[in-house]
Interface confidence: low
């Protein structure tokens, strides 16, 4: 006859490990007892359990409550045992020794592998700002046994670098994702993907990118200077910019205080019916935590009395 077992039995941490040992004998052969022991290199054998055909299962004190026979129905030639709630320390070599009648003793070895699924963590890098060079966007760390694989899934262009740190029974893998920040990356997902034989499916952690920037400011409203004449109502200047975080706006007048009646409403400066005292240099200040920008324009309110020739030209031009 011969013993049937596995070279390697693989379980996930906390699962029950079935250690197979089946004697395939000739008809009439009987199994008297099966002894299970742990036999790691460099250490003496440590008995797990003894299965006796007559007296049943005896479990050694070190494994009390953790070793059982598989549930019935059981084949009398089956010496397999269940090791309950496998932990990392159970990883190693095991041997089953089968005493048969009349063929004698047989032994076989298997290796128990305990997979420790990783619990990945994602750490965002420093605040991303447009204009920086290659910058750490995020790092992702996963520790498990065996070493997990850590990769990135994103539409964003970048570079990755990984390092591994071996512990006594596991390995930690850290992967860093570096990129050159640009405003187009705002809101883009950066996903860390962790693969491991102990996971039914890849674990994914997503980080949304935020890149601070502030666009150049410009002022709208003066496209047609001839509309800025005394008495005109509803004249307004609008400051245009965009940024992340969203910017705030502030209006000042370079050559003095803002005239009375001029309304500041965020990015818009609203004028009452125009008078010559509204002529001047207006400055829009745009700022966020990242930067600030200024844009200035000159308002020249026309007096039709003083410039009747010009008005005639405008009329004829129309």
């Amino acid at each position: 006859g011969e013993l049937e077992t596995s070279d390697v039995v693989t379980v996930v941490l906390g699962q029950d490990a079935k250690l197979p040992c089946f004697y395939r004998g000739d008809s009439g052969e009987q199994v008297g007892q099966v002894a299970w022991a742990r036999v790691d290199a460099g250490e003496g054998a440590q008995e797990l359990a003894l299965l006796h055909s007559k007296y049943g299962l005896h479990v050694s004190p070190a494994y009390e409550g953790r070793v059982e026979q598989p549930p019935p129905p059981r084949n009398p030639l089956d010496g397999s045992v269940l090791l309950r709630n496998a932990v990392q320390a159970d990883e190693g070599e095991y041997e089953c020794r089968v005493s048969t009648f009349p063929a004698g003793s047989f032994q076989a070895r298997l290796r128990l592998r305990v997979l420790v699924p990783p619990l990945p963590s994602l750490n965002p890098g420093p605040a991303l700002e447009e204009g920086q060079g290659l910058t750490l966007a995020a790092s992702c760390t996963a520790e498990g046994s065996p070493a997990p694989s850590v990769t990135w899934d994103t539409e964003v262009k970048g570079t990755t670098s990984s390092r591994s740190f071996k512990h006594s029974r596991s390995a930690a893998v850290t992967s860093e994702f570096h990129l050159v920040p640009s405003r187009s990356m705002n809101g883009q997902p950066l996903t860390c993907v962790v693969s491991h034989p102990g996971l039914l499916q890849d674990q994914r952690i997503t980080h949304i990118l935020h890149v601070s920037f502030l666009a150049e400011a410009s002022v709208r409203g003066l496209e047609d200077q001839n509309l800025w004449h005394i008495g005109r109502e509803g004249a307004m200047l609008k400051c245009l910019s965009e940024g992340q975080p969203p910017p705030s706006y502030n209006w000042t007048r370079l050559d003095g205080p803002l005239p009375s009646g001029v309304r500041v409403d965020g990015d818009t400066l609203g004028f009452p019916p125009l008078t010559t005292e509204h002529s001047g240099i207006y400055v829009c200040h745009v700022s966020n935590e990242f930067s600030s920008r200024d844009s200035q324009v000159t308002v020249d309110v026309l007096d039709p009395q003083e410039d009747s020739g010009k008005q005639v030209d405008l009329v004829s031009a129309s």
């Epitope: 750490n123 890098g125 750490l136 790092s139 760390t141 740190f165 071996k166 512990h167 006594s168 930690a172 850290t174 860093e176």
Partner: antibody, heavy 117, light 107 residues
Amino acid sequence: QVQLVQSGSELKKPGASVKVSCKASGYTFTSYYIHWVRQAPGQGLEWIGWIYPGNVNTKYNERFKGRVTITADKSTNTAYMELSSLRSEDTAVYYCARSNPYVMDYWGQGTSVTVSS
Amino acid sequence: DIQMTQSPSTLSASVGDRVTITCRASQSVNNDVAWYQQKPGKAPKLLMYYASNRFTGVPDRFSGSGYGTDFTLTISSLQAEDLAIYFCQQAYRSPYTFGQGTKLEIK
């Protein structure tokens, strides 16, 4: 590459305090521990304590409890070690070192602290 | 506190020699032991971690072994640049303690 750059030498009087800084670069500051270790002239290495900048947890060697405070500023990637009530036997080179979690893989260049009246 | 006792305290050897430094812990520290090399006037550098793992960039002439209380750092073929003080450290339980150091001299 990983770098830890420490502040310059200090000369202090007994009873005073000293605060040594350690600026980290080349890695994610909040993902590793920073340890402080000292070495008296011609002597061995003595562990003072650690901080984990990710959640600012600290652990101190009982020998220094009450006299040492380790802090970290995430905005500047800088760790600090402050030792108070200085005495002459605190004269040493003070090192910061990064670890993950207790093996110190990269060290600062060291800061010499001399306590003398 | 866990005491780490290194021996010898000084060691003189010739280039090409095989050199062994030992470190004994006052209680079991599993394999949570690191070895550091410190050259004169410089900060320590990590050589080995978890007793037998060589750190990045460390030449393979350095090796480590041990578990429990007894640990060994071996240099298979001594080079002139290995002149330094070597420290062991237990990372098993706080406070993390170091051996007193072994000064390695070149004959």
